[in-house]
């Protein structure tokens, strides 16, 4: 016998397309950016890729995901220092041996160009003009997102 | 010479308990359950805890939190099955030899009573009556949430 | 102000042990990739170890690797060095230095120390 | 591990002069190298970095150029405070960090 719980999961796989009237967020919250229908916060400490991930999570956000060049590009253009390195939510996946956003999306190899090798604890950071392969223990920078959206949006099913 | 970002950033650290208009969350979203402050949303499918934790934010949400003992028997309440483990968001800290929230807080000695070895890769999980110790890799269910919050909510500091 | 001062350096016999610190001030120590870099009288210049934030990621230049240790205490804003079995190559002016921020394991050295003198000779 | 080798290994010059120095390194570093000035019984300072970054607080009179294994110091109009040794470093994310052997830059 099903659970209420389990009763409502089964309902959210058969209902992944449902929008749902509830407040979206119209306006970036204070101190994040906007860049087109995201609002982003890039960090001032540095932590390695899991606390960063963990740290957008506790701010109701996610590490950020990038769609294409084009945001990519849009992004970087925000970074003012050459140097600096920021987590982006895309890490190696050994298991499936491919580069896997935190979405559980794959990496269309065309989006972006990583400089260094795609293996085992490997994470990705971007720079000001570069995409870099970096050992996901490395202690840097990230970048949160979180969606603008209209008042009527998307439900949440599993991933 | 700091970028606007870094400014922004230094900005935030020295405006921890500012609040800011913006829309809060003030229903909870189509299939996430309300529990006091708070929506919960239970997985129907498994992950290991780093996955879940993705999952969680790639919702804009957080694995779930749990304040004390209180929230902790409610959050059980709504457990059906006396089986079933869900992560939550609290895992092993090697570096401080401590149980840490993804928030950045230790765990409180007194507010869970944890069954199982305090130890490298272990996250923890809840049943409908306990609480365990678990390797991270393990595959089970998880909780995210979300914080209903009024119109008038905290901005998002670095952790 | 920002500054970085090395101290424990000293004449010290083949075989002995030295630990070097070096105290941090003027700006947010957790958050930087610290390194002790060295340069023997009259040559050019050798990373030696870096130590991540955190503490958690170490590494060693081949030449000091098993002998040497480094260490940080974040509340203290200090770094350490911990030298032992010491040898007459290992005498050089040891150099505290912070990387720029958020560059990762990618370092370059944007402060650094006055340095400290150890000499290894019998 | 990656080998840089500077050349020359000292230059003399007069100050008002262009003074180049270049840097080799054994395999390919992409961007990860920083140039270094040091004066005698000082610790070094951090000039360029990521190949072509000024560092904060440094002339533009020094810039950096290259990528790959082929980077470029260049002091465009020589003072008498630049009379000093210059080092690279490469800056690859796999230790060791590795330093050229400096090039000297004396006094015509």
């Known amino acids: 016998q099903k659970s209420s719980i389990e009763k409502c999961s089964v309902d959210i796989q058969q209902s992944r397309n449902k929008t749902t009237e509830r407040p979206g967020l119209l306006n970036c919250p204070i101190y994040w950016q906007q860049l087109r229908e995201k609002c982003l916060l890039f960090s001032h400490t540095v932590n390695p890729w899991n606390n960063s991930l963990a740290d957008c999570s506790t701010k109701e956000s996610s590490l950020l995901l990038i769609r294409d060049k084009d945001e990519l590009i849009h992004t970087q253009n925000l970074i003012r220092d050459k140097a600096i390195l920021f987590w982006i939510g895309l890490n190696f996946s050994l298991s499936e041996k491919n580069w896997k956003w935190i979405n559980g999306s794959f990496l269309n190899s065309n989006d972006l160009e990583i400089r260094g090798d795609a293996k085992e604890n490997s994470c990705i950071s971007i720079s000001q003009t570069s995409v870099y392969s970096e050992y996901c223990s490395t202690e840097i920078r990230w970048i949160c997102q979180k969606e603008l959206t209209p008042v009527r949006n998307k439900v949440y099913p599993d991933s | 010479q700091k970028s606007s970002i870094e400014k922004c950033s230094v900005d935030i650290q020295q405006s921890r308990n500012k609040t800011t208009e913006r829309p809060g969350l003030l229903n909870c979203p189509i299939y996430w359950q309300q529990l006091r402050e708070k929506c919960l949303l239970f997985s129907h499918t498994v992950n290991p805890w780093n996955n879940s934790l993705a999952d969680c934010s790639t919702k804009e949400s957080s694995l779930l939190l749990i304040r004390d003992k209180d929230e902790l028997i409610h959050t059980q309440n709504l457990i059906r099955d006396k089986a079933i483990l869900f992560w939550i968001g609290l895992n092993f800290s090697l570096s401080e030899k401590n149980w840490k929230w993804i928030n950045g807080s230790f765990l409180n000695s007194n507010d869970l009573e944890i069954r199982g070895d305090a130890k490298e890769n272990s996250c923890i999980s809840i049943s409908q009556t306990s609480v365990y110790s678990e390797y991270c890799s393990t595959e089970i269910r998880w909780i995210c949430q979300k914080e209903l919050t009024p119109v008038r909510n905290k901005v998002y500091p670095d952790s | 102000q920002v500054q970085l001062v090395e101290s424990g350096g000293g004449l010290v016999k083949p075989g002995g042990s030295l630990r070097l610190s070096c105290a941090a001030s003027g700006f947010t120590f957790s958050d930087y990739y610290m390194s002790w870099i060295r340069q023997a009288p009259g040559k050019g210049l050798e990373w030696v170890s870096y130590i991540s934030p955190s503490g958690a990621t170490i590494a060693y230049a081949d030449s000091v690797k098993g002998r040497f240790t480094i260490s940080r205490d974040n509340s203290k804003n200090t770094l350490y060095l911990q030298m032992n079995s010491l040898r007459a190559e290992d005498t050089a002016v040891y150099y505290c230095?912070?990387?720029?921020?958020?560059?990762?394991?990618?370092?370059?050295?944007?402060?650094w120390g006055r340095g400290t003198l150890v000499t290894v000779s019998s | 591990d990656i080998q840089l080798t500077q050349s020359p290994s000292s230059v003399s010059a007069s100050v008002g002069d262009r003074v180049t120095i270049t840097c080799r390194a054994s395999?390919?570093?992409?961007?990860?190298l920083a140039w270094y000035q040091q004066k005698p019984g000082k610790a070094p300072k951090l000039l360029i970095y990521a190949a072509s970054g000024l560092q904060s607080g440094v002339p533009s009179r020094f810039s950096g150029s290259g990528s790959g294994t082929d980077f470029t110091l260049t002091i465009s109009s020589l003072q008498p405070e630049d009379f000093a040794t210059y080092y690279c470093q490469q800056s690859t994310s796999f230790p060791p960090y590795t330093f050229g052997g400096g090039t000297k830059v004396e006094i015509k």
């Open positions: 230095a912070r990387s720029l921020m958020a560059t990762g394991t990618h370092l370059y050295f944007d402060l």
């Open positions: 395999q390919g570093i992409s961007s990860w």
